[in-house]
């Protein structure tokens, strides 16, 4: 299973649920669904309040039980380490795959943390991070921001991923804006 890591704003906008959590239990495999289940302890929710409604405590995260079908494997054994998890809701359950945005909270830049906490949501409605995978590539819409990190280095390590968000400048126009300049 291969997939290009998304820009964190794309991960935020395309996910039903974005939370901060600790992985606290060993994975279990359900013998009916053949999904692997990790026990988590949620510490913060950044997106998904409406989707979850009253059941706003997520205790498990689900993933396919094999690597070849994009199952997520949690490598850290540190149960006190917090992770940012962006996933999809299926039948009220949080699902993730290899392609989901799952990262140690401490590995995120301050700008990314600010993005997940409050800023990325501003760009979800109107703006689109548009990956530029090979030269030449051009904007297809004024609401697109060209994401060129992949051309230079690992996409999740790039400057645009770590420090910028694609946000509305005016109606019909989105531009890269520094998350440092956003009010914390």
């Amino acid at each position: 299973c291969t997939c290009v890591p998304p820009h964190p704003q794309t991960a935020f906008c395309n996910s039903d649920l974005v939370i901060r959590a600790k992985f606290v239990g060993t994975p279990e495999v359900n013998q009916t669904t053949l999904y692997q289940r990790y026990e988590i302890k949620m510490t913060k929710m950044y997106k998904g309040f409406q989707a979850l409604g009253d059941a706003a405590d997520i205790r498990f995260v689900y993933t396919p039980a094999m690597e070849s079908v994009c199952g997520y494997f949690h490598r850290s054994h540190n149960r006190s380490e917090e992770f940012l998890i962006a996933g999809k809701l299926q039948d009220g359950l949080l699902h993730i795959t290899t392609c989901s945005f799952v990262a140690p909270w401490n590995s995120l830049s301050l700008a990314q943390r600010r993005g997940f906490t409050k800023t990325y949501t501003v760009g979800c409605e109107e703006c689109t991070v548009f990956p530029c995978l090979s030269i030449p590539c051009k904007l297809q819409s004024g609401t697109h921001c060209l994401w060129t990190d992949q051309l230079l280095q690992g996409s999740e390590k790039g400057f645009q991923s770590r420090h910028l968000a694609c946000l509305p400048r005016e109606p019909g126009l989105c531009t890269w804006q520094s998350l440092r300049s956003q009010i914390a």
């Epitope: 009916t32 669904t33 039980a65 199952g71």
Partner: antibody
Framework: QVQLVESGGGLVQPGGSLRLSCAAS????????MSWVRQAPGKGLEWVSA????????YYADSVKGRFTISRDNSKNTLYLQMNSLRAEDTAVYYC??????????WGQGTLVTVSS | DIALTQPASVSGSPGQSITISCTGT?????????VSWYQQHPGKAPKLMIY???NRPSGVSNRFSGSKSGNTASLTISGLQAEDEADYYC??????????FGGGTKLTVLG
């Protein structure tokens, strides 16, 4: 009591196709993942494929991926294995078993698939 | 082929105890408590003897027991009987390969 009965085995030429069936009875079929496991003559057991209770998730061993397709019809309590592009090394007794990747608590009697020209 | 490592054969006299080992890695045996053991008599289908490392299905004699330490699982048969003569296979869940079996161990009951 739980019963699993395989059928559909036989002699087939290399490159040919075969469809195995497994009729299940004595339990709520849709509540269990099911697997196919094979055993080449004089050899050990090899897990081939598994499918979730609903049929929504399917898994394959690398040796059969892209050639075999597992499926199920819960209304008929039947498990299937469609085998295409068969090779000599696919020759084996094929068992259907109740369970996914482990803890296979009931097995059929097996059906022999021979791939030879 | 990816397989768990079992001794090809073990033997024992009636009444004795024998242990069959099953060695894997931290990705399979060592990583999950999902080890199963199967008994297979010649020409017959396998039969589940132990599940989830150490649990016995109903109907299986309490002479059969399972355990695990690190990356190695073990099946112990105490008070060996003639009808225990068979092939024994271990199996484990593996996140990469789905399910892996051991190569099998032929148990011979002497005398």
């Amino acid at each position: 009591q739980v019963q699993l009965v395989e059928s559909g085995g036989g002699l087939v030429q290399p490159g040919g196709s075969l469809r195995l069936s497994c009729a299940a009875s004595g339990f709520t079929f849709s509540s269990y993942a099911m697997s196919w496991v094979r055993q080449a003559p004089g050899k050990g057991l090899e897990w081939v494929s598994a499918i979730s209770g609903s049929g929504g998730s399917t898994y394959y061993a690398d040796s059969v991926k892209g050639r075999f397709t597992i499926s199920r019809d819960n209304s008929k309590n039947t498990l299937y294995l469609q085998m295409n592009s068969l090779r000599a090394e696919d020759t084996a007794v094929y068992y259907c078993a109740r369970g996914g990747f482990f803890n296979m608590d009931y097995w059929g009697q097996g059906t022999l698939v021979t791939v030879s020209s | 082929d990816i397989a768990l490592t079992q001794p090809a054969s073990v033997s024992g006299s009636p009444g004795q105890s024998i242990t069959i080992s099953c060695t894997g890695t931290s990705s399979d045996v060592g990583g999950y408590n999902y080890v199963s053991w199967y008994q297979q008599h010649p020409g017959k289908a396998p039969k589940l003897m132990i599940y989830d490392v150490s649990n016995r299905p109903s109907g299986v004699s309490n002479r059969f027991s399972g355990s695990k330490s690190g990356n190695t699982a073990s099946l112990t048969i105490s008070g060996l009987q003639a009808e225990d003569e068979a092939d024994y296979y271990c199996q484990s869940y593996d996140f990469t390969y789905g399910s892996v079996f051991g190569g099998g161990t032929k148990l011979t009951v002497l005398g």
